[in-house]
Interface confidence: low
Amino acid sequence: EAHKSEIAHRFKDLGEQHFKGLVLIAFSQYLQKCPYEEHIKLVQEVTDFAKTCVADENAENCDKSIHTLFGDKLCAIPKLRDNYGELADCCAKQEPERNECFLQHKDDNPNLPPFQRPEAEAMCTSFQENPTSFLGHYLHEVARRHPYFYAPELLYYAEKYNEVLTQCCTESDKAACLTPKLDAVKEKALVAAVRQRMKCSSMQRFGERAFKAWAVARMSQRFPNAEFAEITKLATDVTKINKECCHGDLLECADDRAELAKYMCENQATISSKLQACCDKPVLQKSQCLAEIEHDNIPADLPSIAADFVEDKEVCKNYAEAKDVFLGTFLYEYSRRHPDYSVSLLLRLAKKYEATLEKCCAEGDPPACYGTVLAEFQPLVEEPKNLVKTNCELYEKLGEYGFQNAVLVRYTQKAPQVSTPTLVEAARNLGRVGTKCCTLPEAQRLPCVEDYLSAILNRLCVLHEKTPVSEKVTKCCSGSLVERRPCFSALTVDETYVPKEFKAETFTFHSDICTLPDKEKQIKKQTALAELVKHKPKATEDQLKTVMGDFAQFVDKCCKAADKDNCFATEGPNLVARSKEALA
C-alpha cells in the first residue's frame, strides 16, 4: 500500500531506536571516512525530520523518497569533494542515478586501521557512561568497514554486544568475562559480513533470478515439509529483502524482514515444526533465530526424485510448458531431500539438469537421452565430497595455523600476482574453515565447507576486481558464482609467473615483533611465507618447512634475548643467507 510519507511510515514501523541505528548504518556505509560525530549529527537531523512527518504527513518534503532525503543530507556535507573525491560527482545526478552512483563508490577495502578493541576497564567505563553512544560507535565502526553488512543483522549484533557488556562490566575480572564472549560475537559477525557480501555480489552480477534460485534451495533444505508454493513465497520475500539491503534501502529492508518473520510465525503449520522457539523472541532475535533455524525433519514418504523428473514420459512437455516453474520444482524436490549438500552443489545439479533437458528435449528420443541424468550427477557430487575429506584430514593433521599456511602456499602458487596482504587475509579466512566445519557431524560438513569457502572466495574476487592482476583469478571470478569454488580448486601453479627477486628487507625483522599479539605475529610470519613462495613458486614443502622453522626459531630466540635489537640485527642477515641457500 502507498504511504503519503515513506519516512514517517518507516519510523512508525521500526520505532525510534532501530530507525536511528539503521540511518547511522546507512550513512556509515555510504561515507566510510566520516567520523562518528559527523554521522550522528546527520542521524539526529533525519530523526527529527521523520518525527515532524509522523506528526504531519503533509509537512514540507515529507513526501520525498528516502533515497532523496538521505542523498540530499549526504550531498550537503561540507568539503565532500576534499574527503571523497569523485564520489562528490554523484551529487550532480538525480535519483535513482544518484543512489546508484553512491553504491558504486562503496569501498570493500577502505583504508581504515583495524578495529582495535579498547582495554576492558576503559570499555566498561565508556559503556556505562553512555551506552547509546558506545553502541553507536560500534555500528559506525563495523558498517564503515563492511559497507554491505546486512543492516538488521548488524542491529542484532549490537544488541548482543550490549548484552555482553551489561553482563561482564559488573564482574570483578572484566577482561576474562568480555574477551571470549566478544571474540565469539566478532567471529560470527565477520562470517556474516562475507556471507552477505556474497549475496550482494550474486544480486549485482547475476540478478534476482539467480539469488532466488539460491533462496529456493536454502529454504527447501530447511523446510522440507513446506509445499513448493510456500517455499516460492518465502524465497520471493527473502530476495526482495536482500535486494533492498544490498541496494541501500535499509529501512525498507529491516521493515520487510520483520514482516517476513511475523508471516513465518503466523504460518508455522505450513512451513516447519521447528519455528516455535524463535517465534517467542523479540523482533531482532526472532529474525536472526529464523535465519539460523535447524532443518526440519525430512518427510518419511518422499518418492524417488526420478519419478517426476526422469521416468515421467511428459518431462519435456512439462519443461516446455513452464520452464522456470518446472526447474524450480526440481530444485525444490532435490534440495529438500539433501540437507547434506551445499547450496552451490544443488545449484550446479539444477544447472546440469536444465542443460540436459535443453539438449535432450530437442532430440528424437528424449527419454533415452535424459534417462541417465541422475547418474551423471555423480562426479559433480563426488568432487566437493573429496575436497571436504582431503582438507579436513589436512586440518586435523596440522591444526588451524598450519592448515592456514598450507592454504596460503597453495593460493600463492595459484595466483602469485595477487598482493600479499590479500593472499594472507584470504588464506587465514579459508583456513578457518577447518575449525568452523571439520568438527561438525559428517552430514553437515559439506554444506558448511563449500558454502563458507564460496563466500570467502567471493571476498577475494571483490578485492581483486578493484585491482585485477591475475588472469586466472579474473577467469574464476568472471564465471558463474556456483562454479567459482571448483574453478579455484582446479587452479595449479601459475607457470607464466616470473618469480619475484629476493629482497633482504622483506625478510628483515625487528624487536617490535616480540610485543605483537599472537594473531599479528602469525600474520607477520604468513606474510614472509607468501613472499618466499613468490620468490620460489616451485619450492617444495620440505624447503618451505625448513625455512619457516628456521624463521620461527630465530624470532623465538631473539625475543628471549637480553638485547633483542642486537639479536635481530646480527642474526637477521644470517637467517636471510640461510633461507636463500635452502631455497636455491
Partner: nanobody, 119 residues
C-alpha cells in the same frame, strides 16, 4: 469435483485493458496457490503468473511484469488477472490452473478464455 471457470476475455485494442476472472469450486481454494497460463495461436503453453494462497504474488513472467496484476478473493473463491497496456503478442487463450503441490504438472485447468489484442 474440481471446477475452474474463466471469463472476461474478448477483443481489445493495443494499449487497452481487460480483467479476467476464474471461479473455482470443488477444492479448498484458500489453501491452494493458483496460476494463469496462456497459449498463443500455434505456440506452446506460456506460464503468466502465480499467486500464493495468502494473496501475495510470487511470480510474474518477464513478458508481463509491470503490466499484469494477479489477485484473488478467497471469500468468493475467485482468481483475477488485471491486464493493462495490452500488446498484440498478448493474444492467446488464457487458462487458470490450480498450482500443484510438488511438481511442474498442472492437474486442474479451466476451459480457457480468449483474449485478442488487435487494432
Amino acid at each position: 469435483e474440481v471446477q475452474l471457470l474463466e471469463s472476461g476475455g474478448g477483443l481489445v485494442q493495443p494499449g487497452g485493458s481487460l480483467r479476467l476472472s476464474c471461479a473455482a469450486s470443488g477444492f479448498t481454494f484458500d489453501t491452494s496457490s493458483m496460476l494463469w497460463v496462456r497459449q498463443a495461436p500455434g505456440k506452446g503453453l506460456e506460464w503468466v503468473s502465480v499467486i500464493h494462497q495468502s494473496g501475495t504474488p510470487t511470480y510474474y513472467a518477464d513478458s508481463v511484469k509491470g503490466r499484469f496484476t494477479i489477485s484473488r478473493d478467497n471469500s468468493k473463491n475467485t482468481l483475477y488477472l488485471q491486464m493493462n497496456s495490452l500488446r498484440a503478442e498478448d493474444t492467446a487463450v488464457y487458462y487458470c490452473a490450480k498450482f500443484p503441490s510438488t511438481h511442474g504438472k498442472f492437474d486442474y485447468w479451466g476451459q480457457g478464455t480468449l483474449v485478442t489484442v488487435s487494432s
